[in-house]
């Protein structure tokens, strides 16, 4: 960056090179060029010459003042007009940064996705800091008192093999950057209570033409957890409001759930599960679309979906699984 240039003087920032966004700052430039008494000193920000708020302090030094500086990053350099020189002479340059100290991390959550072999910890970092901010996740065994620390820039995956201090732990997060540090509240966890079952997936849908047409949704999970509670939500794609059905599930076989739906309407389905009685849910599954026929039976599978129709024939279409704003992977 600009910091690595050869300098013929010095450039510096008061109060500091990294400062709180919105502060008033002063940038000083001090020339030390052989055989040059600078006629004029110039400041450049991101390559553009500054015209205002420049004060000459003495023969070799000038100051540039910014009120309420709001740019996260800027490259500053200054030059001198030397007698008998046609071009400006570079004095020095500096990259400056503004931002915020971190907020207190909150909503610390740790889960173990079944078969992942990891405990995944996440948190709400709060407002954007704009500057390099790191997080230290502290994991302390309540049985052995041993503490491990993990440095990260966002979330952390901790191998469950490294959690050798029994089942009960305290977890907390420390956020730090050049402007400050904050620490979350401590979260107490039991490893057996934070397992999220293997993802539930809707594989196909079928509408049976009976007296009252019935749609069957087929769905499954590879979980080995015995007691699992699930929710399936569904709505017409034109609607805002979801309908939710609850199930106590045993995944030794593919689940079939029945719905009585309006004909000739495109519906969307999602499913999520949790270990019965535990705290955390899976994120909602990918969107699964199914259009009910006017009168003709129809099958929609995970593999194929187009809104194509063939007179009287069973037709399949592709489930794109695009997420909508209603499809946040909430695990709380």
């Amino acid at each position: 960056g600009i910091t690595n240039i050869n300098c013929s003087g010095h450039i510096w920032v008061e109060p500091a090179t990294i400062f709180k966004m919105g502060m008033n700052i002063s940038i000083y430039c001090q020339a030390a060029i052989k055989n040059c008494q600078p006629r004029k000193l110039h400041f450049y920000k991101n390559g553009i010459k500054e015209r205002f708020q420049i004060t000459r302090i003495n023969k070799t030094t000038a100051r540039l003042w910014y009120k309420n500086f709001l740019e996260p990053h800027a490259s500053m350099y200054c030059t001198a007009e030397c007698p008998k020189h046609f071009q400006e002479t570079l004095i020095c340059g500096k990259d400056i940064s503004s931002g915020y100290p971190p907020d207190i991390p909150d909503e610390v959550t740790c889960v173990i996705y079944e078969y992942s072999g990891n405990m995944t910890c996440t948190w709400n970092a709060g407002k954007l800091t704009y500057i390099d901010t790191k997080y230290v996740v502290h994991v302390k065994s309540l049985e052995t008192e041993e503490e491990q620390q993990y440095l990260t820039s966002s979330y952390i995956n901790i191998s469950t093999d490294s959690l050798q201090g029994g089942k009960k732990y305290l977890v907390w997060v420390q956020a730090a950057n050049a402007l400050g540090m904050e620490e979350s509240k401590q979260l107490q966890i039991h490893l057996d209570d934070i397992v999220i079952p293997s993802a539930a997936v809707i594989s196909r849908a079928e509408t049976i033409n009976a007296t009252v047409p019935k749609t069957i949704i087929y769905w499954d999970s590879q979980t080995t957890i015995e007691k699992v509670s699930c929710e399936m939500r569904y709505k017409a794609t034109t609607n805002q409001t979801w309908n939710v059905k609850e199930f106590d599930t045993n995944f030794t076989y593919v689940q079939q759930s029945e719905f009585y739906l309006e004909p000739n309407i495109k519906y969307v389905f999602q499913v999520r599960c949790q270990e019965t009685g535990k705290r955390y849910w899976q994120p909602w599954s990918s969107l699964f679309f199914h259009k009910t026929p006017e009168t003709v039976p129809q099958v929609t599978s995970k593999a194929f979906q187009h809104d194509t129709w063939n007179s009287g024939l069973t037709v399949a279409s592709i489930s794109t699984g695009h997420l909508t704003s209603d499809n946040r992977g909430d695990i709380g």
């Epitope: 910091t3 510096w12 008061e14 109060p15 500091a16 000083y28 730090a176 950057n177 540090m181």
Partner: antibody, heavy 119, light 108 residues
Framework: EFQLQQSGPELVKPGASVKMSCKAS????????MHWVKQSHGKTIEWIGY????????SYNQKFKGKATLTVDKSSSTAYMELRSLTSEDSAVYNC????????????WGQGTSVTVSS | DIVMTQSPAIMSASLGERVTMTCTAS???????LHWYQQKPGSSPKLWIY???NLASGVPARFSGSGSGTSYSLTISSMEAEDAATYYC?????????FGSGTKLEIK
């Protein structure tokens, strides 16, 4: 000439509080961060926190939150640090240090205030 | 916290000898925010080298600093009596700002 003049030594009882001062002269007090550090006998230097006199913004080492409180009096160009609920672990020399942008470092230090906690 | 580990803890050098001490950070530190302080008994620390390699005002040219990432060093090209002191490295990269435990340099 820049100078940071700190208050004299303190002998205090366990559980008590102490408030020490750091008077700045020779520069514009409000324009520079003031940092505080702790140096225990035979131990390294520990950073306690800083205050920016212009705005009153503070930042603390998590270890000293609840132990130290930093304040300033702009009219007298003086920074203060109060330590509370003192124990023998708090016996140390405490320094204020100006953070100067020229070096982007703590460029001028006070002579230190010695605190001894003893019953 | 970024832990700054200095080695050796104590060293002695003869006058005129070349001296090198090291400082290792537990995670990467920007060279702009790695400083060295000199402290003599009964005195407060003094800024000695700033931003890894720049000498503070009044520091003799026999001192130099170098390094990047997690590994930094301070070198005296030719030891003089007045250089006997404790030298601390310090990172201002990320809060809490931390100091090394110091290298005490004595005259042999």
């Amino acid at each position: 000439e820049f100078q940071l003049q700190q208050s004299g030594p303190e002998l205090v009882k366990p559980g008590a509080s102490v408030k020490m001062s750091c008077k700045a002269s020779g520069y514009t007090f409000t324009n520079y961060y003031m940092h505080w550090v702790k140096q225990s006998h035979g131990k390294t230097i520990e950073w306690i926190g800083y205050i920016y006199p212009n705005s009153g913004d503070t930042s603390y080492n998590q270890k000293f939150k609840g132990k130290a409180t930093l304040t300033v009096d702009k009219s007298s160009s003086t920074a203060y640090m109060e330590l509370r609920s003192l124990t023998s672990e708090d016996s140390a020399v405490y320094n204020c240090a100006r953070f100067g942008g020229f070096y982007d470092a703590m460029d001028y230090w006070g002579q230190g205030t010695s605190v001894t906690v003893s019953s | 916290d970024i832990v700054m580990t200095q080695s050796p803890a104590i060293m002695s050098a003869s006058l005129g000898e070349r001296v090198t001490m090291t400082c290792t950070a537990s995670s990467s530190v920007s060279s702009s925010y790695l400083h060295w302080y000199q402290q003599k008994p009964g005195s407060s620390p003094k800024l000695w080298i700033y931003s890894t390699s720049n000498l503070a005002s009044g520091v003799p040219a026999r001192f130099s600093g170098s390094g990047s990432g997690t590994s930094y060093s301070l070198t005296i090209s030719s030891m003089e009596a007045e250089d006997a002191a404790t030298y601390y490295c310090h990172q201002y990269h990320r809060s809490p700002f931390t100091f090394g435990s110091g290298t005490k340099l004595e005259i042999k």
